[in-house]
Interface confidence: low
Amino acid sequence: SAPGEDEECGRVRDFVAKLANNTHQHVFDDLRGSVSLSWVGDSTGVILVLTTFHVPLVIMTFGQSKLYRSEDYGKNFKDITDLINNTFIRTEFGMAIGPENSGKVVLTAEVSGGSRGGRIFRSSDFAKNFVQTDLPFHPLTQMMYSPQNSDYLLALSTENGLWVSKNFGGKWEEIHKTVCLAKWGRKGTIFFTANHNGSCSNDRGMLELERTTDYGKSFKTVASKIYSFGLGGKFLFASVMTGKGTLRAIHVSVDDGDTWNMAQLPPVGHEQFYSILAANDEMVFMHVDEPGDSGFGTIYVSDDRGTVYSKSLERHLYTTTGGETDFINVTSLRGVFTTSILAEDKSVQSVISFDQGGEWVPLRKPADSKCDATARDPEKCSLHIHAAYSIATGLNVPMLPLSEPNAVGLVLAHGSVGDAISVMRPDVYVSDDGGYTWIKALEGPHYYTILDSGGIIVAIEHSSRPINVIKFSTDEGQCWQTYTFTRDPIYFTGLASEPGARSMNISIWGFTESFLTSQWVSYTIDFKDILERNCEEKDYTIWLAHSTDPEDYEDGCILGYKEQFLRLRKSSVCQNGRDYVVTKQPSICLCSLEDFLCDFGYYRPENDSKCVEQPELKGHDLEFCLYGREEHLTTNGYRKIPGDKCQGGVNPVREVKDLKKKCTSNFLSPEKQNSKSNGSAGGSGGLNDIFEAQKIEWHE
């Protein structure tokens, strides 16, 4: 494991006094109920805290909310409950914070059963002032801001009406009834599924997918027989019932539903599901569930059209019951993803891909670590990291793996070293190179966060006992120092730092408990005096990402290019600063066959990089549809991997083939698409079985 508190560590001098001068306590005058915290805007220092205390009575729930505001990153809070007329706020809707730096906030109030509609409180000045607005409907979901214009809001009502506001919630208009799911698309487009029979729960698979580009003046039905739909990057996905009525197939559009292609993916039955694990404007990671209650499926990666898919990973863990998957995009290094597979012996094992799903390998264990009891060979094993599935299973894992785009190469995760994920108490492991190598950084489970673009890592031990100590590292987790932030330990509930990992402030949340009362308390620690000076050129060093063999000319080439970064030296204790920008130098690589995926009708035999034609497409029940009718597809068998920037080198040219295959999808063809003006039949029904998982783009 990493060196602890010994001489090898570059210790920060006099840190206790420096941190003590920058530790701010705030005790909230509240009975302990629930607390939620939201940052308003970027680099504004504004935090809103909503505390809620519920008293469940037989007939109704009586509650009390308090709203607090800080404008100095949590060092001081002011009670602003009077700005919302001391109203009880519905915690299940949370605080709807506007995109970017709009300064907009919407709070949804609890109203009495007999009221005509709901009530919201709106602020457009970073919660300095609020306006009370009574709604003409009862909201079913949190208000959804248009990504392009935060004045435009979308909401579903409990009666399944779709409501739009164009003036930040001041005035609302119902634009459609019997709506099951609605989402903002690009350029102010709204997509939604509707059932004109009125039920959302019973008729999955009989929904219409509709689109409006003028906020409800007119509508276009872009697809029928819809089970569900999702948006990811430039892609619009719809799972559509096939002719047999029991199977569903994925259809993809890159023009907002004007035209559709059928994805070259296996169809699924009613007990299975599709899930978009990740998507950008270039490609998609799609999980396809296996038949039965297996708890696993297969990951496919798409081409740039979203229609041709290559098998990426089999036996991918994704539970049917809870919908948990360990799939994680390691945002601190391009092309890196981790997830878990369910092995034949039912053990869960971690795998990592450094090339956007091209190949998956076990995680290399720390050099000096011993294999645990799960290992058959005590010398040969790998690191396994805990993610959503471990948390859902109730293991002692307080946090998901953590990485930040501006903390290049840095990854923190709970894990164990063996043949499979262990149910034993996990430790915290840190990688500084995007997951290629790891060190054991902390014994036992911890909460952790990244500050100052990786310049500081802060951790707090996960314990059922009250705590009063934090640990911090200024060298990417190699060495740790401890600071006692209060004499009176608190029951810890959460660690909060501004999203984006640019801040140098950390807030420790918890409660104190005496014989009769318990109160919320926060401690905000500013690390600015620990990192006394701004970093200079001499504090940075050149680092080649994905480097595994420095002798190889193509070393570091991933998806056709390599990148050199300026990284902060571990020995430098200085501030990257809030305006820090990652400095990187890309260089293009020569193409090899690994830069291409096999086009439709071709496949790669095992241990071969060449794409071979599927003999007469035998044994393949995959249907390939272009624009909902029979088409010719010309291909040379290879297609550049989405996002691959290679040039020169291998240029796989094959004789051009004509592939013709009848499309048997009963998907609605564009020429049959109909337009209509506003207004449709009434009806009601609940939003059922459609959800967005943690960082998962779309799950049916």
Epitope: E271, G292, D293, S294, G295, F296, L317, T319, T320, T321, G322, S340, L342, E344, D345, K346, S347, V348, D372, A373, T374, R376, Y389, T393, G394, L395, D419, A420, I421, S422, V423, M424
Partner: antibody, heavy 121, light 109 residues
Framework: EVQLLESGGGLVQPGGSLRLSCAAS????????MNWVRQAPGKGLEWVSA????????YYADSVKGRFTISRDNSKNTLYLQMSSLRAEDTAVYYC??????????????WGQGTTVTVSS | EIVLTQSPGTLSLSPGERATLSCRAS???????LAWYQQKPGQAPRLLIY???SRATGIPDRFSGSGSGTDFTLTISRLEPEDFAVYYC??????????FGQGTKLEIK
């Protein structure tokens, strides 16, 4: 409080049938795999059958395969064991148990009080 | 099929003493999939240990589990009167899904 309550046991002749029920309460039934485990008089524990949370997958010990059928009704929070072609060696106390995670085995953490099945002429 | 053999068949000890119960597998078992149960006369079994060494909820810390591969041990550091019972080890595998050991009877000397 998490509870499992078996019922349906009794005396039955060889070759006969019996249906055991297990009523679950205090937890989200559909999220858990469930098992039947039996214990013959004066003997040890023997696993009989298991069923996944959704009911989509079922598993049986070789000694009961083809004769016993495990099922569940998640809307009623109830687990069933349909036993047919019963033999004298099926005589035992039958326990309903909770617990199997994919990839983790957290043990059978909840057991019912058991129901007695006697197969005799 | 993996066979679990527990030893000794019967263990006679006095309250306050230390008890060591053994469970040996016919082939290697992942420690993540080994559990121990306690059963008192006329009662249903109770889960003590899962994952070879993790104590189940509410189990006193005098109970501990250890081992890997084919050899596993349940240790009761200081016997209390209520600890005298039959103890079973169990593994979770593929076919059959679960197998139990034949049990060790812990009786008062």
């Amino acid at each position: 409080e998490v509870q499992l309550l078996e019922s349906g046991g009794g005396l039955v002749q060889p070759g006969g049938s019996l249906r055991l029920s297990c009523a679950a309460s205090g937890f989200t039934f559909s999220s858990y795999a469930m098992n039947w485990v039996r214990q013959a008089p004066g003997k040890g524990l023997e696993w009989v059958s298991a069923i996944s949370g959704s009911g989509g997958s079922t598993y049986y010990a070789d000694s009961v395969k083809g004769r016993f059928t495990i099922s569940r009704d998640n809307s009623k929070n109830t687990l069933y064991l349909q036993m047919s072609s019963l033999r004298a060696e099926d005589t035992a106390v039958y326990y309903c148990t909770r617990g199997r995670g994919i990839g983790y085995y957290n043990g059978m953490d909840v057991w019912g009080q058991g129901t007695t099945v006697t197969v005799s002429s | 099929e993996i066979v679990l053999t527990q030893s000794p068949g019967t263990l006679s000890l006095s309250p306050g003493e230390r008890a060591t119960l053994s469970c040996r597998a016919s082939q290697s078992v992942s420690s993540s999939y080994l559990a121990w149960y306690q059963q008192k006369p006329g009662q249903a079994p109770r889960l003590l240990i899962y994952g070879a060494s993790s104590r189940a909820t509410g189990i006193p810390d005098r109970f501990s589990g250890s081992g890997s591969g084919t050899d596993f041990t349940l240790t009761i550091s200081r016997l209390e009167p209520e600890d005298f019972a039959v103890y079973y080890c169990q593994q979770y595998g593929s076919s059959p899904m679960y197998t139990f050991g034949q049990g060790t009877k812990l009786e008062i000397k």
